[in-house]
Interface confidence: medium
């Protein structure tokens, strides 16, 4: 089997003129992509991969959020030479959230990494943007996390700050196939610029004190208190999912034109941001991009 | 049918300055990888430059790099390519070619640009 | 000096077989980058003829065929005509210089 073969980190690893071909291990007999975009309320930026891949054919899309941070996935197996070409893989102008200035700043200011390196989204480097509310949402947190995507045998991963929902979440995280978003929040201008210690204690949870010994006629009742690690994902009536690629529209023109519907429009996109003027762009629109005209 | 029809080339001196665009039609110019590629007269082609369908992401030949600049505007289906400290070896036809599968599969019928003292 | 290397020329006559050659390296061809070919008749732009190392755009006659290996490329033209007569330029993406890099160029001359 011979399968295209990419990797995107925010970048251009997967832009039309790069692509490549791999022949697959025996006893490989499915060529598989992945996208998996992430936009916060300053942006957004996709990872990629393409390659051969393991399993059975078929699609799986999904879409996600965690604490007003919207993930999108879509994954597509196929068993024919070079069919993994469907997917729009290449990374959407990081651009901002169209009207966002028509939202007032709400007082707080967080550290944004929308498609930064590691390197460039260290410690106080990365820019600082201003916090609003969108959608009926307040976003009074700063987040830092980690989104990563797996596929083809491939890892890539990526850090993410940005304004959020929630002041106080710990090591929450929301997955999709082979995709996982993960971090945490803090409550406080620029509070995230690392947060990869945080331990569970937040204002939110009554510290822990020691109790005077029981007397012998009580009994010391203490309030359980859980912490959740797995952000609820929402209800399927919000929570969109992409749709699957066989049912995007095919590309313009004539046959062999199929020009690269580059950056990621997620179509659909998490409830939340419906009045950001950037929903309903993600990720992969534009048709099949596979060579539809062998043999002729 | 896709078109891509460029313009702005001509006779300039070295260190001189020239625009040349690419208006576009037939294809959803937005949703295109568009680059320009060049040939000196009777030599081969030389890639140039690329921009990704947002303008996000620009590449340049190492031999233009700081002295040309890629745009597009959306809005107008054209492509551009602003091009300064102009020298003789930029002398060439200047094709602007769309990126399919790929690869460059619609391609403009060029424009002259002459650099010369 | 091209970062793919073509043969300068090519020759044949109506209704023979020609191959044209492209010698890569390990940061294009061989880096598993696909190869395209042009076809470009004189006085005129370049036209795609063969992408993705072995597919034909539609409308292009299946006389012509491309294949790959290691970090070369071929075009093979089968049954020649007057009308092939042009200069045939391959194509790939190369790591080092991060852009697109064509060869040379083979002018084809049908005798």
């Known amino acids: 089997l011979e399968c295209y073969s990419c990797v995107q980190k925010a970048d251009d690893g997967c832009s039309p003129n790069k692509m490549k071909t791999v022949k697959c291990a025996p006893g490989v007999d499915v060529c598989t992509e992945a996208v998996g975009a992430v936009e916060t309320i300053h942006g957004q930026f996709s990872l990629a991969v393409r390659g051969c891949g393991s399993g059975l054919p078929g699609k799986n899309d999904r879409g996600l959020d965690l604490h007003g941070l919207l993930a999108f996935i879509q994954l597509q197996q196929c068993a024919q030479d070079r069919c993994n070409a469907k997917l729009n893989l290449t990374s959407r102008a990081l651009d901002p959230a169209g009207n966002e200035s028509a939202y007032p700043p709400n007082g707080v200011e967080c550290y944004s990494c929308v498609g930064l390196s590691r390197e460039a989204c260290q410690g106080t480097s990365p820019p600082v943007v201003s916090c609003y509310n969108a959608s009926d949402h307040v976003y009074k947190g700063c987040f830092d996390g980690n989104v990563t995507l797996t596929a083809a045998n491939v890892t890539v991963s990526l850090p993410v700050r940005g304004c959020v929902q929630d002041e106080f979440c710990t090591r929450d995280g929301v997955t999709g196939p082979g995709f996982t978003l993960s971090g945490s929040c803090c409550q406080g201008s620029r509070c995230n610029s690392d947060l990869r210690n945080k331990t569970y204690f937040s204002p939110r949870i009554p510290p822990l004190v020691r109790l005077p010994p029981p007397e012998p006629t009580t009994v010391a009742s203490t309030t359980s208190v859980t912490t959740s690690t797995s952000a609820p994902v929402r209800p399927t009536s919000t929570t969109k999912p992409m749709p699957a690629p066989t049912s995007q529209t095919p590309r313009q023109g004539v046959e062999h034109e199929a020009s690269r519907d580059e950056e990621p429009r997620l179509t659909g996109g998490a409830a939340g941001h419906q009045d950001r003027s950037n929903s309903g762009q993600y990720p992969a629109k534009g048709g099949p991009q596979q060579p539809h005209n062998k043999g002729c | 049918e896709v078109q891509l029809l460029e313009s702005g080339g001509g006779l300039v001196q070295p260190g001189g300055s020239l625009r040349l665009s690419c208006a576009a039609s037939?294809?959803?110019?937005?949703?295109?990888?568009m680059s320009w590629v060049r040939q000196a007269p009777g030599k081969g082609l030389e890639w140039v430059s690329y921009?990704?369908?947002?303008?996000?992401?620009?590449y340049y030949a190492d031999s233009v790099k700081g002295r040309f600049t890629i745009s597009r505007d959306n809005s107008k289906n054209t492509l551009y390519l602003q091009m300064n400290s102009l020298r003789a070896e930029d002398t060439a036809v200047y094709y602007c070619a769309r990126e399919g599968l790929w690869a460059f599969d619609y391609w403009g019928q060029g424009t002259l640009v002459t650099v010369t003292s | 000096q091209s970062v793919l290397t073509q043969p300068p020329s090519a020759s044949g006559t109506p209704g023979q077989r020609v191959t044209i050659s492209c010698s890569g390296s390990s940061s294009n061809i061989g880096a598993g980058y696909v190869v395209h070919w042009y076809q470009q008749l004189p006085g005129t732009a370049p036209k795609l003829l063969i992408y993705?190392?072995?597919q034909r755009p539609s409308g292009v006659p299946d006389r012509f065929s491309g294949s790959k290996s290691g970090t070369s490329a071929s075009l093979a033209i089968s049954g020649l005509r007057s009308e092939d007569e042009a200069d045939y330029y391959c194509?790939?993406?190369?790591?080092?210089?991060?852009?697109?890099?064509f060869g040379g160029g083979t002018k084809l001359t049908v005798l």
């Open positions: 921009i990704s369908s947002s303008g996000s992401t620009i």
């Open positions: 037939g294809f959803t110019f937005s949703n295109a990888w």
């Open positions: 194509a790939a993406y190369d790591d080092s210089l991060n852009g697109p890099v």
């Open positions: 993705d190392n072995n």
